[in-house]
Interface confidence: low
């Protein structure tokens, strides 16, 4: 079958990194600079993605694969294949149309991206607030008041965990 297909379509023999050049008797020509073909048998090469401005090149374009972009420091990727870069905010903030704004009282954001979320309502689970919430951290719920009757073991609040990926630069 492969042999038959090759006889019918010489372009099927052109490997990735080349294109089947109809202008040159269907010779397999190398992709021009700043273009690529990731599969064999292609009649054109695709233009490489250019990582410009707020985008930064994570992986260079080669003759067989497209460039991959990420975002410059202070921004993070959004969308498939990092199609957009969105500004980072500080922990305790969220990005609005007017820029980074502090979380309203009763909400928190422990990341540099995303929106402020409401503190956990401990009372819904019959628990009490052990550690108050902040703009950067959710509340820590502890045992219900009944559990803290005389004779019950005391609970030491846990140390706040360091967020992975947000270590100081």
């Amino acid at each position: 079958f492969e042999r038959t297909r090759s006889l019918q379509d010489p372009c099927s023999n052109c490997p990735a990194g080349t294109f089947c050049d109809n202008n040159r008797n269907q010779i397999c020509s190398p992709c021009p600079p700043n273009s690529f073909s990731s599969a064999g048998g292609q009649r054109t090469c695709d233009i490489c993605r250019q990582c410009k401005g707020v985008f930064r090149t994570r992986k260079e374009c080669s003759s067989t694969s497209n460039a991959e972009c990420d975002c410059t420091p202070g921004f993070h990727c959004l969308g498939a294949g990092c199609s957009m870069c969105e500004q980072d905010c500080k922990q305790g903030q969220e990005l609005t149309k007017k820029g980074c704004k502090d979380c309203c009282f009763g909400t928190f954001n422990d990341q540099k991206r995303g929106i402020c979320r409401p503190w956990t309502n401990c009372s819904l689970d019959g628990k009490s607030v052990l550690v108050n919430g902040t703009k950067e951290r959710d509340v820590v719920c502890g045992p219900s008041p009944a559990d803290l009757s005389p004779g019950a073991s005391s609970v030491t609040p846990p140390a706040p965990a360091r967020e992975p990926g947000h270590s100081p630069q």
Epitope: N34, E60, P164, G165, Q169
Partner: antibody, heavy 116, light 107 residues
Framework: QVQLQQPGAELVKPGASVKLSCKAS????????INWVKQRPGQGLEWIGN????????NYNERFKTKATLTVDISSSTAYMRLSSLTSEDSAVYYC?????????WGQGTTLTVSS | DILLTQSPAILSVSPGERVSFSCRAS??????IQWYQQRTNGSPRLLIK???ESLSGIPSRFSGSGSGTDFTLSINNVESEDIADYYC?????????FGSGTKLEIK
């Protein structure tokens, strides 16, 4: 084959400026970044900055922003680094190297001596 | 800036042994690490890119591993020609930074 050619040595006086060259051959000059790296005697490697000949975009290490200026001449496939207000601290080997993330080809380096 | 810490400063091994170089990043950098060899009075040579990708022309005894913050360059069956300084370099963010290097000595 890919080659990056650099002069072997430069001797300049303190306070002066110098323009180091890096002539590329064996590949399409406008398709790859050129990086500059400093190495003082007996010391490690320090990245100065890079330039993309295709659009002359540059990135600099903050430490070298007022010291180094990167340019290219497309017609001769040559990258340049101008170092200004030279002091003895600038005496080092300066390498040019091709590549955006991994620096896959390096010049032989230019030994810069700043001395009166 | 991202700090790369290489340890130890000097490694001494016998020919034929396996040796490993360590490089630790001050923050999580995925696999955006490269390894270079620099022989005395020579230019650096790229050995490994993206933490573990080998390059054509580099002997197969060189290999790389790691992700996140901890990275390792290994040499199987060390030869006398491997005497050199070895540097890691991050390309996660500007400015690129290099580790301080590890010197390989042969006993």
């Amino acid at each position: 084959q890919v080659q990056l050619q650099q002069p072997g040595a430069e001797l300049v006086k303190p306070g002066a400026s110098v323009k180091l060259s890096c002539k590329a051959s064996g590949y399409t000059f406008t398709n790859f970044w050129i990086n500059w790296v400093k190495q003082r005697p007996g010391q490690g490697l320090e990245w100065i900055g890079n330039i993309y000949p295709g659009n002359t975009g540059t990135n600099y290490n903050e430490r070298f922003k007022t010291k180094a200026t990167l340019t290219v001449d497309i017609s001769s496939s040559t990258a340049y680094m101008r170092l200004s207000s030279l002091t003895s601290e600038d005496s080092a080997v300066y390498y040019c190297a091709r590549g955006q993330l991994g620096l896959d080809y390096w010049g032989q380096g230019t030994t810069l001596t700043v001395s009166s | 800036d991202i700090l790369l810490t290489q340890s130890p400063a000097i490694l001494s091994v016998s020919p034929g042994e396996r040796v490993s170089f360590s490089c630790r990043a001050s923050q999580i950098i995925g696999t955006t690490i490269q390894w270079y060899q620099q022989r005395t009075n020579g230019s650096p040579r790229l050995l490994i890119k993206y933490a573990s990708e080998s390059l054509s022309g580099i002997p197969s005894r060189f290999s790389g591993s790691g992700s996140g913050t901890d990275f390792t360059l290994s040499i199987n069956n060390v030869e006398s020609e491997d005497i050199a300084d070895y540097y890691c370099q991050q390309s996660h963010s500007w400015p690129f930074t290099f580790g301080s290097g590890t010197k390989l000595e042969i006993k």
